[in-house]
Interface confidence: low
């Protein structure tokens, strides 16, 4: 039975050209985390494997940094980075847990005026 829950940073906004940390945390389970995948829509961004360490997809290796922890740091943000991000925890014996983060990348002037992304 899967008892765990994923806590994420939820819906976040960041400034174009800046950086952001995507964080997920698996709690309420004693299952062993074997691998965490970070995905953006149809694209695998990064893998953190318990045995093999980090792997960053080629198209993103210069803009994505592993960590902190099992999180992911996105750098040199563009408006095209706006969208859904998923942390997928592969665990034993529970199976797979998935967390969702929505990132909105704002033009600098918009960000400076305190605009926030909110789901209605």
């Amino acid at each position: 039975m899967m008892t765990g829950t994923i806590e994420t940073t939820g819906n976040i906004s960041a400034e174009k050209g800046g950086s952001i940390i995507l964080q997920c945390h698996l709690s309420s389970t004693t299952a062993q985390v074997t691998q965490v995948n970070w995905e953006q829509q149809d694209q695998l961004l990064a893998i953190c494997n318990a045995d093999l360490g980090w792997h960053i997809s080629p198209s993103f290796k210069d803009r994505v940094a592993p960590g902190p922890g099992l999180g992911l740091t996105l750098q040199s943000l563009t408006v095209n980075d706006t969208g859904e991000y998923f942390c997928i925890y592969h665990t034993y014996p529970d199976g797979t847990y998935t967390g969702r983060i929505f990132l909105e990348v704002l033009e600098s002037s918009v960000a400076e005026h305190g605009a926030r992304f909110q789901i209605p």
Epitope: N49, P58, S59, S76
Partner: antibody, heavy 115, light 107 residues
Amino acid sequence: EVKLVESGGGLVQPGGSLRLSCATSGFTFSDYYMSWVRQPPGKALEWLALIRNKANGYTTEYSVSVKGRFTISRDNSQSILYLQMNTLRAEDSATYYCARDGGYWGQGILVTVSS
Amino acid sequence: DIQMTQSSSYLSVSLGGRVTITCKASDHINNWLAWYQQKPGNAPRLLISGATSLETGVPSRFSGSGSGKDYTLSITSLQTEDVATYYCQQYWSTPFTFGSGTKLEIK
């Protein structure tokens, strides 16, 4: 939905030239590495060329077998990938695939070099 | 250039059986390895990237393992639709070389 569609293949004489195109849709083209891969009939896949994304200055890399004869390029405004092939040889006959980082491939286009 | 060696050109396996396809790199590729499945007349299909990560929609009977220079694709409970040629590819350093392929057949 990510789509890659190759065109421009066909029959060409040895020593001739051909330009392959790969029209793409469903993703932000300039964000991704793009490649060309070929497969001669009944043989293995061969990686040919790579053009990196905007973040990496659209720099290119080639396999030894095509370096100096083939040129990979991209039109980011039209989301099209190209492969200019010059001084073609019989051994260049193959199905040519364009591919996007992340495992997306076109259906392939046949190029036959023969007199 | 990094050479990728798939030692078995052909493998014959019983339906429902387990098969292991190996791929050896001539130098360390730090898990930057992909496995592709190709059926006649079709483009290759990405199964696994980063040596271990199963692509969305790929059945869980496929798995990848390995590190350093040695990598493995395993298929359990072999199905008829798994009959295909399997290629490994390193993308640690250009040129991003492929293995010569392993053709899987049903015994």
